[in-house]
């Protein structure tokens, strides 16, 4: 499956929106930094099949969508930017869904990518627990936003690699 150029642009637009969402000085949040244990190995194109990597991207975007569509998230961010962010994520989910089903049969997807999907889910579980522990403070949200931007950047770079391999 050749991920469309629009998907890459959508990813870039999502990153720009995430960058624009910042509300407070990042410098005041340094002591809130946290190691969420981003599952980098799941997105390693050399180690995993293309379908698995795409499936992991799909799960990451789905989990990001879930995270930013909570009541607490709505209270933390600008509504207009958040709505635009949802649209970009939704479009990417559609692109990836089409891609995954094209790579392998629907039945095989769940079994084949169970470990990578679980790793991504656990990663987002740690993010959610961190936010709860920090009582959804502005700095906690800034740290999470920075983390999501980093993981998005990482997956964007890998998607470029996947497109080149086609």
């Amino acid at each position: 499956c050749d991920l469309p150029q629009t998907h890459s642009l959508g990813n870039r637009r999502a990153l720009i929106l995430l960058a624009q969402m910042g509300r407070i000085s990042h410098f005041s949040c340094l002591k809130d930094r946290y190691d969420f244990g981003f599952p980098q190995e799941v997105f390693d194109g050399n180690q995993f099949q293309k379908a698995q990597a795409i499936s992991a991207f799909h799960e990451m975007i789905q989990q990001t969508f879930n995270l930013f569509s909570t009541k607490d998230s709505s209270a933390a961010w600008d509504e207009t930017l958040l709505d635009k962010f949802y649209i970009e994520l939704f479009q990417q989910l559609n692109d990836l869904e089409a891609c995954v089903t094209q790579e392998v049969g629907v039945e095989e997807i769940a079994l084949m990518n169970e470990d990578s999907i679980l790793a991504v889910r656990k990663y987002f579980q740690r993010i959610t627990l961190y936010l709860m522990g920090k009582k959804y403070s502005p700095c906690a949200w800034e740290v999470v936003r920075a983390e999501i931007m980093r993981s998005f950047s990482f997956s964007t770079n890998l998607q470029k690699g996947l497109r080149r391999k086609d």
């Epitope: 910042g22 410098f27 340094l30 002591k31 930094r33 740290v143 950047s153």
Partner: antibody, heavy 121, light 107 residues
């Protein structure tokens, strides 16, 4: 390949102004902060200040507040350190380094090669 | 500002020796501590971040430990290329501050 390339050595007279640069490449420039560090001849490292190129938010060490200005031009992936009036005591090697901001990643993992500033009458 | 104090300021050791450098913060910095190596005429190089995480490409003979106010950098078996100056730096709050450095010389 990630690189921070600094401008060349400068020889200036006391009272002159100066602006040195640090150009980032091989990574998303706005996703990392840029810090500046001074090292006077034969001395240790002194942290001067930091800038977030995404919005130009800047913080200085109290020792350097009002003595230098840190700025950035994200359109050309370049950070700057400038003096409006140099003193002989500004003679030092100046380094820039990138910082991952609030994301969990190694701090100051890439450094520029350094810019030697000599201020002498 | 958070003060960082390194000890010793210099030490002499032989190739193969186990070397330990300590760093103390004037207040708790959790595990937000970095260690750098600097050779004459060169830019500093990150060795350890977050007190104990080894930076990619750094030999495993380097290790870091500690949390709160007391930290240690250990070189398990000193190699000829390890003779340099080592700095600790706190990264929990601005301004980030460095220790005064520890120079490791050949005995």
């Amino acid at each position: 390949e990630v690189q921070l390339v600094q401008s060349g050595a400068e020889v200036k007279k006391p009272g002159e102004s100066l602006k040195i640069s640090c150009k980032g490449s091989g990574y998303s420039f706005t996703s990392y902060w840029i810090g500046w560090v001074r090292q006077m001849p034969g001395k240790g490292l002194e942290w001067m200040g930091i800038i977030d190129p995404s919005d130009s938010d800047t913080r200085y060490s109290p020792s350097f507040q009002g003595q230098v200005t840190i700025s950035a031009d994200k359109s050309i992936s370049t950070a700057y350190l400038q003096w409006s009036s140099l003193k002989a005591s500004d003679t030092a090697m100046y380094y820039c380094a990138r910082h991952p901001g609030l994301a969990w990643a190694p701090d100051f993992d890439y450094w520029g090669q350094g810019t030697l500033v000599t201020v002498s009458s | 500002d958070i003060q960082m104090t390194q000890s010793p300021s210099s030490l002499s050791a032989s190739v193969g020796d186990r070397v330990t450098i300590t760093c103390r913060a004037s207040q708790s910095i959790n595990r937000f501590l970095n260690w750098y190596q600097q050779k004459p005429g060169k830019a500093p190089k990150l060795l350890i971040y977050a007190a104990s995480s080894l930076q990619s490409g750094v030999p495993s003979r380097f290790s870091g430990s500690g949390s709160g106010t007391d930290f240690t950098l250990t070189i398990s078996s000193l190699q000829p290329e390890d003779f340099a100056t080592y700095y600790c730096q706190q990264a929990i709050d601005l301004p980030f501050t460095f220790g005064q450095g520890t120079k490791v010389e050949i005995k």
